[in-house]
């Protein structure tokens, strides 16, 4: 006997009815006097419903659970349950027996909305740029877990110290409290946003801190224009000052550098005391200067990955900030040349040759030529692709027909260094080969 | 509702030491310093230091440097205060304050009493 | 260390009167001032912070001004709840430093 569930789950809100579905196909003469309709729970086969003998036998599972029984005949042996909880998640077995019989398992999904958040901010007064705050934010009677997100007033993600807790409560239902932990900049959104998975359903907080300001005016922070070009593992100075008025003393200043895009710290220097790095361990400070007003980062052994924009936050009586590029780079190997086929070369042969240049940041600009500096506009494919460091090996492939004999070169570009790294293949008389014996 | 509960008094003798505790509730412990002031008989209030319960940070005034030792309990949201080599001049009232800039919520104090 | 000085170091006011406390700063501040009251055998609580925001809850009539070195405590139609010692705080630096007290009774 064929049983028919959908394959599905079905996804039912906390304190609704759901319809677990069920079908067979009745045989004609069919009558209910001949039918077995047993549901149960599928794990421990606990019963949950029956129709035997052509009577309801009624729920055996709280009173919450009622077949359609004017629809049975027609082969709808689907079950209504009432006030879904939390504890009714899972699979049931639908069990169809007439002269056969036959069973299938359908799956509840029991899902509940989460509440609105509600952020909190602690301290919540007098805030001065520096200061390190904890937000929480707070939602309530959800199911399944959240998942939570942070984001800042533009919707990029928050990476600060984030710690999430979720508690049951006796009807299984959950309350999620996530807590930010953030360095106040000159003023932000902070944005938590509650995901439940099953329902796609999205539930967002928001928060909005503008810290004190002095009547005394805002502090100038100066940065270079340009970005700050590194080489890949060298070490970097991010220049960032100043202007200290007479009698400043280190007691009164809140130094923060931090990514402009995630507000993740990178360093700081608060009430006197460098609290060093939060970034690696590969930030330092000139501490000798600061007093001098010269508030510039040394970032050492430059990644790939510290590509971005830093921001530079000054607070003294007031604040100031300003946001500097650095821009990584890494030159590209003396090109290593390939030729195929390299035996037995006539004019008119079609050859492949490969240029390969290695380990370079970013991707690089690659131009073919001929003996001349002319170039090559024969079917050229570049590929680039990056190492786990971010660094590329760029592959390109001209496919040429042989002329009597010639020279092609490849030129590898850095667009940042406006480095050009050359490789060269000849090709002469015929017959030949390559390399040249 | 935020409170900071300190014990009412402390018999000690001269030269040993005592820890004073402060236990918070009401609010989110690692969110604020917790700083610890001095204040003897009809005299001011003097800050001694603060400490982060978060990471356990501390500040100390110069003058209590070799005097007090700051610590916290971030399970029990309970911060202490260590005091050594105790003189009858560490007789005072000791307080415990939340805040980094402003002192929002204070402890009742612990009388503290050195005597032989 | 920033120096705190308070005046008076006491005085007593009728009900109704105006009260003006004050306190001098060894260097400029800006407005990193707080206010505290005392009462006898109570611990302080906040009043005023940068120099003239009055904390959730106190009465209108208590009102701070100033910056840099030079603050005072106001407090409009004295109250008989208002006997207390009064302290001055910088938060501009570290150590936090206080003032010595002000202690207002009632005439």
């Known amino acids: 006997l064929e049983v028919q569930v959908p394959e599905d789950p079905v996804v039912a809100l906390v304190g609704t009815d759901a319809t677990l579905r069920c079908s067979f196909s009745p045989e004609p003469g069919f009558s209910l006097a001949q039918l077995n309709l047993i549901w149960q729970l599928t794990d421990t086969k606990q019963l949950v419903h029956s129709f035997t003998e052509g009577r309801d036998q009624g729920s055996a599972y709280a009173n919450r659970t009622a077949l359609f029984l004017d629809l049975l005949a027609q082969g709808n042996a689907s079950l209504r349950l009432q006030r879904v909880r939390v504890a009714d998640e899972g699979s049931f077995t639908c069990f169809v027996s007439i002269r056969d019989f036959g069973s299938a398992a359908v799956s509840l999904q029991v899902a509940a909305p989460y509440s609105k958040p509600s952020m909190t901010l602690e301290p919540n007064k007098d805030l001065r740029p520096g200061d390190t705050v904890t937000i929480t934010c707070s939602s309530y009677r959800g199911y399944p877990e959240a998942e939570v997100f942070w984001q800042d007033g533009q919707g990029a993600p928050l990476t600060g110290n984030v710690t999430t807790s979720q508690m049951a409560n006796e009807q299984g239902l959950f309350d999620v409290h996530s807590v930010l932990r953030v360095v106040l900049g000159a003023n932000g959104t902070y944005s938590c946003l509650v995901r439940n998975p099953v329902l796609q359903q999205d539930a967002h907080g928001s928060i909005t801190i503008t810290p004190q300001r002095s009547p005394t005016g805002a502090v100038e922070v100066q940065v270079p224009e340009d970005p700050v070009v590194a080489l890949v593992g060298t070490d970097a100075t991010l220049r960032c000052s100043f202007s200290p008025e007479p009698g400043f003393s280190l007691a009164q200043l809140n130094l923060i550098w931090q990514l402009t895009d995630t507000k993740q710290l990178v360093h700081s220097f608060t009430e006197g005391r460098d609290q060093g790095s939060a970034y690696a361990n590969r930030t330092a400070l000139f501490l000798d200067l600061l007093a001098q007003g010269n508030a510039s980062l040394r970032l050492q052994r430059v990644r790939v990955a510290d590509e971005g924009s830093f921001t530079c936050f000054v607070s003294i009586r007031d604040f100031g900030s300003a946001a500097v590029s650095l821009q990584v780079a890494a030159p590209y190997s003396k090109p290593s040349m390939t030729l195929e086929p390299n035996k037995d070369l006539r004019p008119g042969d079609t050859v492949t040759i490969t240029c390969s240049s290695y380990r370079g940041y970013p991707e690089a600009e690659v131009f073919w030529q001929d003996g001349q500096g002319a170039p090559l506009t024969g079917n050229v494919t570049t590929s680039q692709m990056a190492n786990e460091q971010g660094l590329f090996d760029v592959h390109s492939v001209l496919r040429v027909v042989l002329g009597a004999n010639g020279t092609y070169s490849c030129l590898v570009r850095n667009p940042v260094l406006q480095q050009d790294a050359h490789g060269s293949v000849t090709i002469t008389g015929q017959p030949m080969t390559f390399p040249p014996e | 509702q935020v409170q900071l509960q300190q014990p009412g008094a402390e018999l000690v003798r001269p030269g040993a030491s005592v820890k004073l505790s402060c236990k918070a509730s009401g609010y989110t412990f690692t969110a604020y310093w917790m700083n610890w002031v001095k204040q003897r008989p009809d005299q001011g209030l003097e800050w001694i230091g603060r400490?982060?319960?978060?990471?356990?940070?501390?500040r100390y005034n110069q003058n209590f440097r070799d005097k007090a030792r700051l610590t916290v309990d971030k399970s029990s949201s309970t911060a202490y205060m260590q005091l050594s080599s105790l003189t009858s001049e560490d007789s005072a009232v000791f307080y415990c304050a939340r805040g980094v800039r402003i002192f929002d919520y204070w402890g009742q104090g612990t009388t503290l009493t050195v005597s032989s | 260390d920033i120096q705190m000085t308070q005046s008076p170091a006491s005085l007593a006011a009728s009900v109704g009167e105006t009260v003006t406390i004050t306190c001098r700063t060894s260097e400029n501040i800006d407005y990193t001032l707080a206010w505290y009251q005392q009462k006898p055998g109570k611990s302080p609580q906040l009043l005023i912070y940068?120099?003239?925001t009055l904390e959730d809850g106190v009465p209108s009539r208590f009102s701070g001004s100033g910056s840099g070195t030079h603050f005072s405590l106001k407090i409009n139609s004295m109250q008989p709840e208002d006997t207390a010692t009064y302290f001055c705080?910088?938060?501009?630096?570290?150590?936090?430093?206080f003032g010595g007290g002000t202690k207002l009774e009632i005439k």
């Open positions: 940068n120099a003239n």
């Open positions: 705080k910088q938060a501009y630096d570290v150590p936090r430093t």
């Open positions: 400490i982060d319960p978060y990471d356990s940070e501390t």
